[in-house]
């Protein structure tokens, strides 16, 4: 029986060009975490295997950094990064636990409005 629960950072927002940490935490189970896969709308971002370490998908290598912990850091955010992210905990013997995070990337207020104002 699956008794665990996943806590996530929930719905978060960040500015374009900035960075954000995606975090999930599995609790209330003694199951062994064998691997955590991070996905963005059915696209693999990264893998953290408990014994073998991290793998960052080639298409995200420039903008994704492993950690902290089993979390994931997204850098140089663009508005196209807005959307759902999933942490998929593969555990033994429980099975798979999935957490969801919604990220909204906002246009920077400085980038959007800064040019309209002149400093005398």
């Amino acid at each position: 029986m699956m008794t665990g629960t996943i806590e996530t950072t929930g719905n978060i927002s960040a500015e374009k060009g900035g960075s954000i940490i995606l975090q999930c935490h599995l609790s209330s189970t003694t199951a062994q975490v064998t691997q955590v896969n991070w996905e963005q709308q059915d696209q693999l971002l990264a893998i953290c295997n408990a014994d073998l370490g991290w793998h960052i998908s080639p298409s995200f290598k420039d903008r994704v950094a492993p950690g902290p912990g089993l979390g994931l850091t997204l850098q140089s955010l663009t508005v196209n990064d807005t959307g759902e992210y999933f942490c998929i905990y593969h555990t033994y013997p429980d099975g798979t636990y999935t957490g969801r995070i919604f990220l909204e990337v906002l246009e920077s207020s400085v980038a959007e409005h800064g040019a309209r104002f002149q400093i005398p």
Epitope: T34, N37, N49, H55, S57, P58, I88, H90, G95
Partner: nanobody
Framework: EVQLVESGGGLVQAGGSLRLSCAAS????????MGWFRQAPGKEREGISL????????YYADSVKGRFTISADNAKNTVYLQMNSLKPEDTAVYYC?????????WGQGTQVTVSS
């Protein structure tokens, strides 16, 4: 769900070689990784090798690095583990596991016994 069937285990003398195979059938959704784990008596299951579906990157535990080689034949839906220079401490049940965007599927395991 993916059905995984391992083969190739057995009894071998120290210093010998074995090649494990893991054939998959069934719906695979979006394949992410194929890996090999092992579990020795009284110990936790440990990951020893992994190959990724996106670029074929391979990863190895320090205990098997330089002795074991993982490979995949996508046309046959099969992943292999070539094990050379086997040691008595490699004795364990070996499991293959595939992860997809939906979950993780395990094989039933194959026994590898290395005698000294």
């Amino acid at each position: 769900e993916v059905q995984l069937v391992e083969s190739g285990g057995g009894l071998v003398q120290a210093g010998g070689s074995l090649r494990l195979s893991c054939a998959a059938s069934g719906r695979a959704f979006s394949l992410r990784t194929m890996g090999w784990f092992r579990q020795a008596p009284g110990k936790e299951r440990e990951g020893i090798s992994l190959i990724t579906s996106d670029d074929g990157s391979t990863y190895y535990a320090d205990s098997v690095k330089g002795r074991f080689t993982i490979s995949a034949d996508n046309a046959k839906n099969t992943v292999y583990l070539q094990m050379n220079s086997l040691k008595p401490e490699d004795t364990a049940v070996y499991y293959c596991a595939w992860t997809t965007n939906r979950g993780m599927d395990w094989g039933q395991g194959t026994q590898v016994t290395v005698s000294s």
